[in-house]
Amino acid sequence: ARNGDHCPLGPGRCCRLHTVRASLEDLGWADWVLSPREVQVTMCIGACPSQFRAANMHAQIKTSLHRLKPDTVPAPCCVPASYNPMVLIQKTDTGVSLQTYDDLLAKDCHCI
Amino acid sequence: ARNGDHCPLGPGRCCRLHTVRASLEDLGWADWVLSPREVQVTMCIGACPSQFRAANMHAQIKTSLHRLKPDTVPAPCCVPASYNPMVLIQKTDTGVSLQTYDDLLAKDCHCI
């Protein structure tokens, strides 16, 4: 159950997909990846106020308990709900190979 | 790829399973659940330092970019890797029913 998509904190403040440009050096990949030289990393960033994009029952519980015990139970967290695959051209012992990673780029986001 | 399980912040400080006792009132369930009266909610709480229990490649990227741009990219977050099902005895219009929820109690945790 994905709950409300209305952000009470104002536009763009709640959990959503962001794109961050990163070089191979930024990612610590320069020694094992040849291409791409730069990655448009899509990731989930933003606040998870009460019931906003709640991923499941667990997220709803977490929201309730965070309201009661904010020092003990953290608020739900903005994380990927699914991923887009990406191919990397990797260095190998003998040359290069193509490797597709299914869990590299966030496709959409929810709170959990 | 689940990376290191050694917590550099000290015992129990990093992402792990915690149990929080909660009443139906705490959870906001009193009007639709009969049993259990109290739930031992297992949830994922704790810090996600570099590569600790990294769920996947995306988590590793997030760690690298958080180190570079801490104000823009948040650290990975401690969330359930899997769930334990739980049955609730629910009130219905005509009486009660049993309903199993697969996404209510965290079973184990990782950082993402």
């Epitope: 291409s35 791409p36 695959p85 191919v87 051209i89 290069v96 590299l104 | -």
Partner: antibody
């Protein structure tokens, strides 16, 4: 494994439009970094890149031929089409469909021969 | 556009020989160069990526080097199956190929 299969008319008349189709398997064009391109080789000559289409629907064309080329994709069928308008005898060639990974022509189809003649 | 000039255009050699093919770019292309092998009646096959990295399954006798404008493909000890045409290609801007080097049995 990656497979690319070109299909075309074999013979086209001058001034007509050449339509080619590439059917591919073993990879997804929705994967970031993937693309499919077309390269041709006139008889006894070298290789010439024509066009390619990328995972994000970006299309690139050889500037010398851009006004005559159209590339498109049908992701549901794993097919790429190329149209070359106003053909002449100089367009007689083997046309290859190629899988791209980022900027690399990683895998090539067997090619389809196209002759332009009246 | 960036021109890629290969030399020689054809070359005769014997099994066991060491062979070097060169490719010169009309402007700096960094290491954005690939090499392909084409046997008669077949489609080209990827050999080298990023100037010096062998594609999967390519024997170690093939090696590439260079950066900027000058690139080489070396076959350290020719095997019978290596007689073919070789093409360099740059991908620094829109892709262009060299005219090819035909490697024949002496």
């Amino acid at each position: 494994q990656v497979q690319l299969q070109e299909s075309g008319p074999g013979l086209v008349k001058p001034s007509e439009t050449l339509s080619l189709t590439c059917t591919f398997s073993g990879f997804s064009l929705s994967t970031s970094g993937m693309g499919v391109g077309w390269i041709r080789q006139p008889p006894g000559k070298g290789l010439e890149w024509l066009a390619h289409i990328l995972w994000d629907d970006v299309k690139r064309y050889n500037p010398a031929l851009k006004s005559r080329l159209t590339i498109s994709k049908d992701s549901s069928k794993s097919q790429i089409s190329l149209k070359l308008s106003s053909v002449t005898a100089a367009d007689t060639a083997v046309y290859y469909c190629v899988q791209m990974a980022w900027d690399w022509f990683a895998y090539w189809g067997q090619g389809t021969t196209v002759t332009v003649s009246s | 556009d960036i021109q890629m000039t290969q030399s020689p255009s054809s070359l005769s050699a014997s099994v066991g020989d060491r062979v070097t093919i060169t490719c010169k770019a009309s402007q700096n292309v960094d290491t954005n160069v690939a090499w392909y092998q084409q046997k008669p009646g077949q489609s080209p096959k990827a050999l080298i990526y990023s100037a010096s990295y062998r594609s999967s399954g390519v024997p170690s006798r093939f090696s590439g080097s260079g950066s900027g404008t000058d690139f080489t493909l070396t076959i350290s000890s020719l095997q019978p199956e290596d007689f073919a045409t070789y093409y360099c290609q740059q991908y620094h801007s829109y892709p262009t190929f060299g005219q090819g080097t035909r490697l024949e049995i002496k």
